[in-house]
């Protein structure tokens, strides 16, 4: 059974992940971003289901294309280089989803834009955080 300290740690990690994803979304949505149109042509896979921490496997599998798109943006709106931002997210995701179980991610048939993709995972984080608090 999860202890209050492990629940608190999970909550803090989710809040950190949420902030990183929101920072990326804000950087992309910035009205001064001239590459937004091009960025929206890149398609991302959306999870069929995202209700548990193990479903973060679906986010982990999309970090590689996310990094590519962020490199394309080369935006001053991000405080960190894409490499470091993605590294941070990767570390949090690995800790949250755990490495004990191998979960096969299932994706929805329809692909999404980077904005839709980020919004989906932001909603996921907010939803899990709300169940923990």
């Amino acid at each position: 059974a999860p202890t209050s300290s492990s629940t608190k740690k999970t909550q803090l990690q989710l809040e950190h992940l949420l902030l990183d994803l929101q920072m990326i979304l804000n950087g992309i949505n910035n009205y001064k971003n001239p590459k937004l149109t091009r960025m929206l042509t890149f398609k991302f896979y959306m999870p069929k289901k995202a209700t548990e921490l193990k479903h973060l496997q679906c986010l982990e599998e999309e970090l590689k294309p996310l990094e590519e798109v962020l490199n394309l943006a080369q935006s001053k709106n991000f405080h960190l280089r894409p490499r470091d931002l993605i590294s941070n997210i990767n570390v949090i995701v690995l800790e949250l989803k755990g490495s004990e179980t191998t979960f096969m991610c299932e994706y929805a048939d329809e692909t999404a834009t980077i904005v839709e993709f980020l919004n989906r995972w932001i909603t996921f984080c907010q939803s899990i955080i709300s169940t923990l608090t």
Partner: antibody, heavy 125, light 107 residues
Framework: QVQLVQSGPEVKKPGASVKVSCKAS????????ISWVRRAPGQGLEWMGW????????NYAQKLQGRVTMTTDTSTSTAYMELRSLRSDDTAVYYC??????????????????WGQGTLVTVSS | DIQLTQSPSTLSASVGDRVTISCRAS??????LAWYQHRPGQAPKLLIY???SLQSGVPSRFSGSGSGTDFTLTISSLQPEDFATYYC?????????FGPGTTVDIR
């Protein structure tokens, strides 16, 4: 100019291990990732895995997971690929290759623009 | 894993012919698709990346097109040195995968 020079051919027995080296020159070694690709006789190209020369981050093909280890030695600008528990179907020409895009990648771009000359590894009893 | 299929597996053509090779992915990969040429006894050579970007130094008779799951490599006028095996590769998601290859031989 960019060069990737690989170690010479190897003949190994089933169950043994092989370690292929790949010495890079002509560019900043730590700014690019290295992929390993092989081609078995009569087969197509098979992606084996990738290593970041910047931070040692690796990604391996699922079918080789547990048998393959990729490493780098930044002091000598050399990449290594070790394959263990060799089987006869591991007989192939092994290539090291450099990423097209550079420094900013955590995951590697995946596009390969420079290749080593290839190392033939023969697994036979 | 993302699977790639190529067609045809073998193609017989003559010098000067226009040649088209298809590559289909099991899931959307655009624009993360590359094309390589592999001649016997040599290392593979990058021709096209990002589905349609011509690699520096590659002749303009080579071109790439497509998006989503369907991609095409076109050689507008086949030259003697173009007889080789051609592979598509997706680099969208790990593990990166190659297609089975299309061998272009002399008719």
């Amino acid at each position: 100019q960019v060069q990737l020079v690989q170690s010479g051919p190897e003949v190994k027995k089933p169950g043994a291990s092989v370690k292929v080296s790949c010495k890079a020159s002509g560019y900043t070694f730590t700014s690019y990732g290295i992929s390993w690709v092989r081609r078995a006789p009569g087969q197509g190209l098979e992606w084996m895995g990738w290593i970041s020369a910047y931070n040692g981050n690796t990604n391996y093909a699922q079918k080789l997971q547990g048998r393959v280890t990729m490493t780098t030695d930044t002091s000598t600008s050399t990449a290594y690929m070790e394959l263990r528990s060799l089987r006869s179907d591991d007989t192939a020409v092994y290539y090291c290759a450099r990423d097209l895009q550079s420094p900013t990648y955590y995951y590697g771009s995946g596009v390969i623009d420079y290749w080593g000359q290839g190392t033939l590894v023969t697994v036979s009893s | 894993d993302i699977q790639l299929t190529q067609s045809p597996s073998t193609l017989s053509a003559s010098v000067g012919d226009r040649v088209t090779i298809s590559c289909r992915a099991s899931r959307a990969v655009s624009p993360w698709l590359a094309w390589y040429q592999h001649r016997p006894g040599q290392a593979p050579k990058l021709l096209i990346y990002a589905a349609s970007s011509l690699q520096s130094g590659v002749p303009s008779r080579f071109s790439g097109s497509g998006s989503g799951t369907d991609f095409t490599l076109t050689i507008s006028s086949l030259q003697p040195e173009d007889f080789a095996t051609y592979y598509c590769q997706q680099y969208r998601s790990y593990p990166f995968t190659f297609g089975p290859g299309t061998t272009v031989d002399i008719r």
